[in-house]
């Protein structure tokens, strides 16, 4: 009685259970009454990452420097190449097919999380007591200067974009 289902790492063809090709190899010929499945290794710059019956290997991803990409991890016969972005850039998607410049946080906003190769800068508004007077992809919100600790008084209040201005205390007559 021909099988209707096959074991793991096998596939059904012509009423026979044939072994799948292992990762890194492609199918040349299905198994027969006389032979096991015939598989061949993937070529240079090709891969297959699963047990398979593919007759063609997949091409490794190309990390195009014109799109700001560089190789993070070189592909093997069993794995695809992993791309990441050049310094100062990040991927536009999980697949990392292109890059964009890291966003800068405007004055009044500070960096909550510095960008990585795969995620953009996360900015946050500077809360009361903090300020940022630059557009930056690295600078956090800085605390206002404490005039008291310098034996000075606040002459001009700070904002989310400016520090306080300290001055000498008025002398009592």
């Amino acid at each position: 009685e021909p099988p209707t289902a096959c074991r793991e790492k096998q596939y059904l063809i012509n009423s026979q259970c044939c072994s799948l090709c292992q990762p890194g190899q492609k199918l040349v010929s299905d198994c027969t009454e006389f032979t096991e499945t015939e598989c061949l290794p993937c070529g240079e710059s090709e891969f297959l990452d699963t047990w398979n019956r593919e007759t063609h290997c997949h091409q490794h991803k190309y990390c195009d420097p014109n799109l700001g990409l560089r190789v993070q991890q070189k592909g093997t016969s069993e794995t695809d190449t992993i791309c990441t972005c050049e310094e100062g850039w990040h991927c536009t998607s999980e697949a990392c097919e292109s890059c964009v410049l890291h966003r800068s946080c405007s004055p009044g906003f500070g960096v909550k999380q510095i960008a990585t190769g795969v995620s953009d800068t996360i900015c946050e508004p500077c809360p009361v007591g903090f300020f940022s007077n630059v557009s930056s992809a690295f600078e956090k919100c800085h605390p206002w200067t404490s005039c008291e600790t310098k034996d000075l008084v606040v002459q001009q209040a700070g904002t989310n974009k400016t520090d306080v201005v300290c001055g000498p205390q008025d002398r009592l007559r």
Epitope: S29, T32, E33, T35, E36, L40
Partner: antibody, heavy 113, light 112 residues
């Protein structure tokens, strides 16, 4: 439908080289393997060697030093070359696909001066 | 080189009677993937061999169910439950587990 047909000289002189061609139709040699078998008159079957779909070959060690099997996928042909012939190489030569029951009709090769 | 030894060499049988042919291998025919590539052919006079049984016990398409194969490891048997006139010829066992593939010496079945 699947067909295999052997062709070559019926008579070859001792010490010469035998060249046989197996022309196939109904399938691609890049996806299927083909092997050669011979049968001396009134005797049993002897496996000669095979050409795998991927292009590699396996030979019978008793013939390996005299044997070359190759293929031209675009022409759908598998070739057998057997050198330094003797009378013991007189046989019907068959090419066979390695699945199902697809045999050529066979070609008789006589080695004689 | 792996040897396949068939017995008997000659098998005279009465029509309608059963017949049995043995094939013994000099080493195990189980492949690394667990398949046993032992096959049976019938060669009628003046014809090319015809596949009857593949992988020990699988009847090839169109082969009558009076033919059956059994065995494992190194000992294998072809049985014909009721011999018919068209069954006359030489029966060969064959293995394709190990290179070189080999054939048994043949068993000639004839009608008594």
């Amino acid at each position: 439908q699947v067909q295999l047909q052997e062709s070559g000289p019926g008579l070859v002189k001792p010490s010469q080289t035998l060249s046989l061609t197996c022309t196939v139709s109904g399938f691609s040699l890049s996806r299927y393997s083909v092997y050669w078998v011979r049968q001396p008159p009134g005797k049993g079957l002897e496996w000669i060697g095979m050409m795998w779909g991927g292009g590699s070959t396996d030979y019978n060690p008793s013939l390996k030093s005299r044997l070359t099997i190759s293929k031209d996928t675009s022409k759908s042909q598998v070739s057998l070359k057997l050198s330094s012939l003797t009378a013991a190489d007189t046989a019907v030569y068959y090419c066979v696909r390695t699945d199902g029951d697809y045999w050529g009709q066979g070609t008789l090769v006589t080695v004689s001066s | 080189e792996l040897q396949l030894t068939q017995s008997p060499l000659s098998l005279p049988v009465t029509l309608g009677q059963p017949a049995s042919i043995s094939c013994r291998s000099s080493q195990s025919l189980a492949s690394s993937q667990g398949n046993t590539y032992l096959h049976w052919y019938l060669q009628r006079p003046g014809q090319s061999p015809r596949l009857l049984i593949y992988k020990v016990s699988n009847r090839f398409s169109g082969v009558p169910d009076r033919f059956s194969g059994s065995g494992s490891g190194t000992d294998f048997t072809l049985k014909i439950s009721r011999v018919e006139a068209e069954d006359v010829g030489v029966y060969y066992c064959s293995q394709s587990t190990h290179v070189p593939w080999t054939f048994g010496g043949g068993t000639k079945l004839e009608i008594k």
